[in-house]
């Protein structure tokens, strides 16, 4: 076996086990794990007399190394005295020595918890010019503690006079603060608060977190839009993965079907974001019939920074079905904007929430970018509603003053569409509606208890309409209000107009 220096441990009794009238006590020192023999153990007993006895070395069976115990028996005023056991092992080195200083007995104590806290970054997430580290030494039995700060394992020259100790009940807490320059903190060094207490060492370390803490990768899987499903008859589903570290293509998106049948060829798109992450979308064409019949599709995402693959699945929404109600209206002329008008479309009480909204002019569908449509939101009942807004120009309405708001939804019959026509100047052009009864469109005037129905043929007073105070679930601007036509013998219907 090669030369090995000893590990040295003090051997003491518990103070509570020593009779208060004891005139002499024995303590010891264990030197273990050394090779070869011998070790020399000497004692410093201070002003007290003592007798020592070193036991013969024993061989540790597994390693072949040696262990020995030296015992010291002292008499007199031993309670307040500290004793030093000095172990020398010349085979390791002529000057190899380990000293252990300790008292006759060990008291029961609660060891401290050591925790380093650090000051916050500024509001922009940047480090301030100086960084404070606070070492909290808490919950220990009151007694002497020594705090040392280390930088990469080297003792730092720190003013420890600022350390403060408080006592709560039977336990004490101490805290020590270290102030670092930003340069030191950013240099990736490790800072350690080391606490010595009752002959034991406790510590906590910290350093600036690495730049490369992986952010949370998220994956989302969309259902096909009703427009793609029922009108274009070429539905697709999209798996969207965001906040990826851009590892040059190591993100894998794999499609599968619950039925085990093969999937179509998917198309993949990658987009680099300004926050340094990658967004990956994979679009999979699905069969209209497969989707309607309830097939489940799965997207599996693997990436080096994911501890395990992300799985997302999608299928046709289950539950009750309800066709949408569609109401369209035009805002009145606004001073200063005579050549532009806003058309609005409220689509409500449909289930499930998947819906596509389109605007048509001259039998031509307008590009999606022309209109803005809210996400479906729940109504007070069990259905959903959306609101769509379209800006039109004078040139458009002078060419043909009829614009159609169309909703595509699976519960709409006969052809999964419901639409409503609206005119900028309703007195000049009639609106038309398909797939549902067209209730009278009512314009309410604020302060009036009754409104005026606006039918193609002209204006007739309408006694069964009153202005409400606005619907809580209506996302539009505050001047929009709700009229309720309390039609006899029919369920009341609501329409949102200007009051």
């Amino acid at each position: 076996a090669s030369t090995q220096s000893p590990s040295v441990f003090p051997l003491t009794r518990c103070c509570k086990n020593i009779p208060s009238n004891a005139t002499s006590v024995t303590l010891g020192c264990l030197a273990t794990g050394y090779f070869p023999e011998p070790v020399m153990v000497t004692w410093d007993t201070g002003s007290l007399n003592g007798t020592t006895m070193t036991l013969p070395a024993t061989t540790l069976t597994l390693s072949g190394h040696y262990a020995t115990i030296s015992l010291l028996t002292v008499s007199g005023a031993w309670a307040k005295q500290m004793f030093t056991c000095r172990v020398a092992h010349t085979p390791s080195s002529t000057d190899w020595v380990d000293n252990k200083t300790f008292s006759v007995c060990s008291r029961d104590f609660t060891p401290p918890t050591v925790k380093i806290l650090q000051s916050s970054c500024d509001g922009g997430g940047h480090f301030p010019p100086t960084i404070q580290l606070l070492c909290l030494v808490s919950g220990y039995t009151p007694g002497t503690i020594n705090i040392t700060w280390l930088e990469d394992g080297q003792v730092m020259d720190v003013d420890l006079s600022t350390a403060s100790t408080t006592q709560e009940g039977e336990l004490a807490s101490t805290q020590s603060e270290l102030t670092l320059s930003q340069k030191h903190w950013l240099s990736d060094r490790t800072y350690t608060c080391q606490v010595t207490y009752q002959g034991h060492t406790f510590e906590d370390s910290t350093k600036k977190c690495a730049d490369s803490n992986p952010r949370g990768v998220s994956a989302y899987l969309s259902r096909p839009s009703p427009f793609d499903l029922f009108i274009r008859k070429s539905p697709t589903i999209t798996c969207l993965v965001v906040d990826l570290a851009p590892s040059k293509g190591t993100v894998n998106l794999t499609w599968s079907r619950a039925s085990g049948k093969p999937v179509n060829h998917s198309t993949r798109k990658e987009e680099k974001q300004r926050n340094g992450t990658l967004t990956v979308t994979s679009t999979l064409p699905v069969g209209t019939r497969d989707w309607i019949e309830g097939e489940t599709y799965q997207c599996r995402v693997t990436h080096p920074h994911l501890p395990r693959a992300l799985m997302r699945s999608t299928t046709k929404t289950s539950g009750p079905r309800a066709a949408p109600e569609v109401y369209a209206f035009a805002t009145p002329e606004w001073p200063g904007s005579r050549d532009k008008r806003t058309l609005a479309c409220l689509i409500q009480n449909f289930m499930p929430e998947d819906i596509s909204v389109q605007w048509l002019h001259n039998e031509v569908q307008l590009p999606d970018a022309r209109h803005s449509t809210t996400q479906p939101r729940k109504t007070k009942g069990s259905g959903f509603f959306v609101f769509s807004r379209l800006e039109v120009t004078r040139a458009e309405w002078e060419q043909k003053d009829e614009f159609i708001c169309r909703a595509v939804h699976e519960a709409a019959s006969p052809s999964q569409t419901v639409q409503r026509a609206v005119s900028v100047n309703p007195g000049l052009a009639g609106g038309s509606a398909q797939s549902q009864r067209a209730p009278d469109r009512v314009l309410c005037h604020s302060g009036q208890q009754q409104g005026l129905p606006r039918a193609a043929g002209g204006s007739v007073p309408h006694p069964r309409c009153h202005c409400g105070a606005g619907r809580a679930d209506w996302p539009g601007p505050p001047e929009l209000d709700v009229c309720v036509e309390e039609a006899e013998g029919e369920a009341p219907w609501t329409w949102t107009g200007l009051c």
Partner: antibody
Framework: QVHLVQSGAEVKMPGASVKVSCKAS????????ISWVRQAPGQGLEWMGW????????NYAQKLQGRITMTTDTSTSTAYMDLRSLRSDDTAVYYC????????????WGQGTLVTVSS | DIQMTQSPSSLSASVGDRVTITCRTS??????LNWYQQKPGKAPKLLIY???TLKSGVPSRFSGSESGTDFTLTISSLQPEDFATYYC?????????FGQGTKVEIK
């Protein structure tokens, strides 16, 4: 601390092959890609290709396609770059570099390996 | 491939000077631009990534900015250890491409 240590300098005859190694330490090897970048004497930096230490996927510069192979050995956290049919204009210092997480920079570099191609 | 045009190709400056190096890209790369410093006989070292984010441990006298397809590396007060060659690199599309370098020499 992240370290990339490359193999020593090589002198090769035209038409020969060279294999440069790059041993990584101080981070989880399979969580990052390794790129190889070369620099001819007195010239700028040229990206040669990339390999994923995660799954071995590769992406090579078009001008080197067919002559270059990149591999990894995850058991030793080592990346290799093999360049065949060497020409005199392949004389350069070859660097391996780790691909950083966000914005894909080369955040840590090996010390470089000088490969001299001469008859 | 995206072309990177760095200017100037070299400059002479004194300790304490403010130094600016620019890099223009042939097409939009968002802010996916990185700056490196290389000293003779040594490997390049990453200074700035994402156009303006300082790598941990890099002195704060280095800063980066962007304006469309123009990117700037600024050394606010040149130190003796800053005399080196600086390269810009785009990581927006494959292959990643580097500028031809700017050598900062002692005046």
């Amino acid at each position: 601390q992240v370290h990339l240590v490359q193999s020593g300098a090589e002198v090769k005859m035209p038409g020969a092959s060279v294999k440069v190694s790059c041993k990584a330490s101080g981070y989880t090897f399979t969580s990052y890609g390794i790129s190889w970048v070369r620099q001819a004497p007195g010239q700028g930096l040229e990206w040669m290709g990339w390999i994923s230490a995660y799954n071995g996927n590769t992406n090579y510069a078009q001008k080197l396609q067919g002559r270059i192979t990149m591999t990894t050995d995850t058991s030793t956290s080592t990346a290799y770059m093999d360049l065949r049919s060497l020409r005199s204009d392949d004389t350069a210092v070859y660097y391996c570099a780790r691909d950083g997480d966000y914005y894909d920079p080369f955040d840590y570099w090996g010390q470089g390996t000088l490969v001299t191609v001469s008859s | 491939d995206i072309q990177m045009t760095q200017s100037p190709s070299s400059l002479s400056a004194s300790v304490g000077d403010r130094v600016t190096i620019t890099c223009r890209t042939s097409q939009s790369i968002s802010n996916w631009l990185n700056w490196y410093q290389q000293k003779p006989g040594k490997a390049p070292k990453l200074l700035i990534y994402g156009a303006s984010t300082l790598k941990s441990g890099v002195p704060s006298r280095f800063s980066g900015s962007e304006s469309g397809t123009d990117f700037t590396l600024t050394i606010s007060s040149l130190q003796p250890e800053d005399f080196a060659t600086y390269y810009c690199q785009q990581s927006y599309s494959t292959p990643p491409t580097f500028g031809q370098g700017t050598k900062v020499e002692i005046k």
